[in-house]
């Protein structure tokens, strides 16, 4: 006995009320032609005909998938009995925007679940969110194609002044964070080490408390705070600041000893390991990887290893006394 | 001004060694790390060896590990790499290079040819 | 390894006219903290390889500005604003995202 056994017993589905004997009768030589794909589709197990009774598999381009009945029955009267079934994207296309506007990162397809952030020319900001998410097969929230970019208020208010200050006559002094912040600015990711606790705060508010001498206030990644691995490097950096030697302003952000100021980006980014330069009496003593040796490292060695996401214990500040 | 000068290429034979040496000046050698890399006829350019200031580490590109080996002198300001089992797909101009915080590879040298032909 | 693919293979610029080079690698090099390690050397004649462009769009030192790099994730843009004689040599761009490091083949800008 096996369960594969055909014994010409003719089967019944669930949504069909006729056995397939019961329906009427064509030449027995007759059968169904290839049926036509959904767009982005293919029939999986093609041939030129097929025989009553017979099912075609319906299967999708890659980057598609099958939404509905994915099978058609070929027919006594040649036709076939096909439900409702479509070829959905399952990635989102590149947006198309502004030329003004910078795509990071710059890809044709993005899968569901990946995000990019759009950026203006410096002294302006995006005229609404920055950052979208792919799902499904389309972009949230939705991309308007009349994005744009607009003058950035923040550079309007500060002149000549550096950020976070405006001109007053002659000279520079600190915005104000309730006066001068009511307009929009970009959001970024912020950490204040006084209540050990990261939020997100408009980049005119934050520029204009750090301004007002509030050291407590770290910068962490602009856009608004999101759990993942930008967020958990940034808190990382925070706590690794505190021994940098170097302490250089970077747009909104302090680049420190194992980061460089990227000019066109006003954004601090990591050295790789061999970039960084010996000098420095920022020794940690620690074990990289699964490996059992001691090594002594410098601030910047350190720096670049956990930016790139390496494994490495700090096992205490100081050379390794072995 | 920084200078790095390559010697020691040459012809060898398959299965042969060659022992590269670079010499580093205008600049403080033991403080950065050093690396080697190379171009074959009419090929590309790629990375095979990098090592720390003080040479307690290196690296190598995976057709080269266990054949190459990357070390240094800092009280020679020299930098130096021995080929062993070498092979004709080994043959090249070897470059020493050493980093700022630019690029990996910021400083490079003139290069020394190595062939390897039987 | 990241395959890194140029193209042109070949440019024939005329002086004083804009000129581009594309690179395009096998995957992101946007790692997971927002940073991308894209590098552009020229290789002149007879010489050993020259910095030019450093992550994605930084100018190295003495590079004259007519040098400028674009791009991101896996697509990537030199371009020269005015070429000029001395710009003749092969182009590569570099990538140091992902271990190992690599380069492009190479592209060749020569003058019309």
């Known amino acids: 006995f096996s369960i594969m056994e055909n014994n010409g017993q003719p089967c019944i589905n669930d949504d069909e009320e006729m056995k397939e004997v019961d329906l009427p009768e064509i030449e027995a030589d007759s059968g169904c032609p290839q049926p036509v794909p959904p767009e982005n589709g293919f029939i999986r197990n093609e041939k030129q005909l097929y025989l009553v009774g017979e099912d075609v598999e319906i299967s999708c381009l890659t980057g598609f998938e099958t939404v509905g009945y994915q099978y058609f029955r070929c027919l006594p009267d040649g036709t076939w009995r096909q439900g409702d079934v479509e070829c959905q994207r399952t990635e989102c296309i590149k947006p198309v925007v502004q030329e003004v506007l910078t795509i990071t990162p710059f890809q044709r397809l993005y899968r569901i679940g990946e995000s990019i952030e759009l950026t203006c020319p410096k002294g302006f900001v995006v005229a609404g969110p920055s950052r979208y998410t792919c799902q499904g097969n389309s972009w949230t929230p939705p991309i308007s194609n009349s994005l744009t970019c607009e003058k950035d208020t923040l550079t309007k208010l500060k002149g000549h002044c550096q950020l976070g200050q405006k001109q007053s006559g002659s000279e520079c002094i600190c915005m104000s964070p309730e006066e001068d912040c009511s307009h929009h600015s970009e959001d970024l990711c912020v950490f204040d080490t006084d209540s050990n606790d990261y939020f997100t705060s408009p980049a005119c508010k934050f520029l204009a408390e750090k301004c007002l001498n509030n050291q407590q206030l770290h910068f962490l990644h602009i856009g608004s705070c999101q759990d993942g691995r930008q967020l958990e490097w940034g808190l990382e950096r925070t706590r690794l600041s505190s021994n940098s030697t170097k302490k250089e302003s970077c747009g909104y952000d302090t680049c420190y000893d194992w980061e460089k100021c990227s000019a066109s980006t006003s954004k601090c980014v990591c050295l790789l390991p061999p970039q960084c330069f010996k000098g420095g009496n920022q020794l940690y003593c620690v074990k990289m990887g699964s490996s059992t040796s001691e090594k002594t490292l410098n601030i910047c060695e350190v720096g670049t290893i956990r930016c790139a996401n390496r494994k490495m214990e700090i096992l205490h500040p100081g050379k390794c006394l072995a | 001004e920084v200078q790095l000068v390559e010697s020691g290429g040459g012809l060898v034979q398959p299965g042969g060694s060659l022992k590269l040496s670079c010499a580093a000046s205008?600049?403080?050698?033991?403080?950065?790390?050093m690396a080697w890399v190379r171009q074959g006829p009419g090929k590309g350019l790629e990375w095979v060896a990098t090592?720390?200031?003080?040479?307690?580490?290196?690296y190598y590109r995976e057709s080269v590990k266990g054949r190459f080996t990357i070390s240094r002198d800092n009280a020679k300001n020299s930098l130096y790499l021995q080929m062993n089992s070498l092979r004709s797909e080994d043959t090249a101009v070897y470059y020493c290079?050493?980093?700022?915080?630019?690029?990996?590879?910021?400083?490079w040298g003139h290069g020394t040819l190595v062939t390897v032909s039987s | 390894d990241v395959v890194m693919t140029q193209t042109p293979s070949t440019l024939s610029a005329t002086p004083g006219q804009s000129a581009s080079i594309s690179c395009r690698s096998s995957?992101?090099?946007?790692?997971?903290?927002?940073?991308?390690?894209l590098y552009w050397y020229l290789q002149k004649p007879g010489q050993s390889p020259q910095l030019l462009i450093y992550l994605v769009s930084d100018l190295g030192s003495g590079v004259p500005n007519r040098f400028s790099g674009s791009g991101s994730g896996t697509d990537f843009t030199l371009k020269i604003s005015r070429v000029e004689a001395e710009d003749v040599g092969i182009y590569y761009c570099m990538q140091a995202s992902h271990a190992p490091y690599t380069f492009g083949a190479g592209t060749r800008l020569e003058l019309k």
């Open positions: 290079a050493r980093p700022s915080t630019e690029a990996l590879f910021a400083y």
């Open positions: 995957q992101s090099l946007l790692n997971d903290v927002g940073n991308t390690y």
């Open positions: 090592i720390n200031y003080d040479g307690s580490s290196t």
């Open positions: 205008g600049f403080t050698f033991s403080d950065y790390y």
